[in-house]
């Protein structure tokens, strides 16, 4: 039911990477507008994106308050120019989103190799600790701050002259690997959260190779 010419939103989908979280839905509005509400399972509803003609709403500011909570959102449909109008039951049309738990479900963004440094036959590879929009004591937390040891990185490395790859893991943001003297190597990293059952992996970082400007070589 609902007001004539007003259709309920559908295909409500959470799009979230490194906790930047947007709710998307359909359809593109024709003579109607939307308002979104979000709440935790036990909390009150908070309205966002009032009377918008967009079909997305950035809910990051709400979910970063507690990324381990489970959130539910709903999208209300109103006739354009008559937002006080309600459906036949006295309520505007709305549709619920799936539940969303940021800590378990946010996608891991593509990591970046910050630097690598060779000392003799060892190379130290450092992964950039990306800043998130999660705050604690007015400070933005990094991905490592949020996930702690739940977050691991897998390093893939190979001689520039061959395709055979090797791999190593760390639950910090640094790798220390053995390499052959006089050989140039290429590196790529992937973030993984082993405790998850879905969305466990990031895409691979861009490849960085020795002999390019990111690294530093020291013969000792």
């Amino acid at each position: 039911s609902g007001t004539t010419n007003t259709v309920a939103a559908y295909n409500l989908t959470w799009k979230s990477t490194n906790f930047k979280t947007i709710l998307e839905w359909e359809p593109k509005p024709v003579n109607q507008v939307y308002t979104v509400q979000i709440s935790t399972k036990s909390g009150d509803w908070k309205s966002k994106c009032f009377y918008t003609t967009d079909t997305e709403c950035d809910l990051t500011d709400e979910i970063v308050k507690d990324v381990k909570q489970t959130y539910l959102a709903r999208v209300f449909s109103y006739p354009a120019g008559n937002v006080e109008s309600t459906g036949s039951a006295g309520e505007p049309l709305y549709e619920n989103s799936p539940e969303f738990t940021p800590y378990l479900e946010t996608n891991l963004g593509q990591p970046t190799i910050q630097s690598f440094e060779q000392v003799g036959t060892k190379v130290n590879v450092t992964v950039e600790d990306e800043r998130t929009l999660v705050r604690r004591n007015n400070t933005f937390l990094s991905l490592r701050d949020v996930f702690g040891k739940d977050l691991i990185y897998t390093l893939y490395y190979w001689k520039s002259s061959s395709s055979g790859k090797k791999t190593a893991k760390t639950n910090t943001n640094e790798f220390l690997i053995d390499v052959d003297k006089g050989e140039n190597y290429c590196f790529s990293v992937q973030a993984v959260i082993p405790s998850r059952t879905v969305n466990r992996k990031s895409t691979d970082s861009p490849v960085e190779c020795m002999g390019q400007e990111k690294g530093e070589f020291r013969e000792i």
């Epitope: 190593a168 893991k169 993984v192 082993p194 998850r196 466990r200 992996k201």
Partner: antibody
Framework: QIQLVQSGGEVKKPGASVRVSCKAS????????VYWVRQSPGKGLEWIGY????????IYDQNFKGKATLTVDKSTSTAYMELSSLRSEDTAVYFC??????????WGQGTTVTVSS | DIQMTQSPASLSASVGRVTITCLAS??????LAWLQKPGKSPQLLIYA?????GVPSRFSGSGSGTDFSFISSLQPEDFATYYC?????????FGQGTKLEIK
């Protein structure tokens, strides 16, 4: 429930090739690497390599480079290992296993490959 | 490559407490798993050196860096071969195995 079901045993002649399959079910196939391990008669476990179905990256033990080729078919959630130029020393039980990054938590039932003239 | 040296190679015991050790040739932090192979497929017992994977609490693991131990208060069904495996860097090597036999 999570299962890895491997293809049946094979008897092959020296110099031939064999393909062993490992069909995964009960979990998101691309979220976990698939490892391959072998156990030769009277010996311990030997790591062959792994494939990441998410990005297609393969890592091999040096001893199995050129011997084993790992592939996946994401549409059927199946991992494959092809062994080429078989010799009697390749006679073994071959296992696939799911990698949870910190360990191998689910294993296939094993496939016996016998190489004999 | 990281070598894993497991000892003893075999152990005869009646029910009671047994300890198996695993020594890594270089530091692997806690990237170590213990597996039981009772004749068929291996089964994961312990991951990250100390964490039980849904197995009875009579099993335990300890250690980090290069020295690791696996302890079990044996039950009749525990007679099998046990392996440590490092999952820190490729190749992800196994120990040689410890065969636990009934005395």
């Amino acid at each position: 429930q999570i299962q890895l079901v491997q293809s049946g045993g094979e008897v092959k002649k020296p110099g031939a090739s064999v393909r062993v399959s490992c069909k995964a079910s009960g979990y998101s196939f691309t979220d976990y690497n698939v490892y391959w391990v072998r156990q030769s008669p009277g010996k311990g476990l030997e790591w062959i390599g792994y494939i990441d179905p998410y990005n297609g990256i393969t890592i091999y033990d040096q001893n199995f480079k050129g011997k084993a080729t790992l592939t996946v078919d994401k549409s059927t959630s199946t991992a494959y290992m092809e062994l080429s130029s078989l010799r009697s020393e390749d006679t073994a039980v071959y296992f696939c296993a799911r990698d949870v990054t910190t360990a191998l938590d689910f294993w296939g039932q094993g496939t016996t490959v016998t190489v004999s003239s | 490559d990281i070598q894993m040296t497991q000892s003893p190679a075999s152990l005869s015991a009646s029910v009671g407490r047994v300890t198996i050790t695993c020594l890594a040739s270089q530091t692997i932090d806690t990237w170590l798993a213990w597996l039981q192979k009772p004749g068929k497929s291996p089964q994961l017992l312990i991951y990250a050196a100390t964490n039980l994977d849904g197995v009875p609490s009579r099993f335990s693991g300890s250690g980090s860096g290069t020295d690791f131990s696996f302890i079990s208060s044996l039950q009749p069904e525990d007679f099998a071969t046990y392996y440590c495996q490092q999952v820190y860097s490729s190749p992800f090597t196994f120990g040689q195995g410890t065969k636990l036999e009934i005395k």
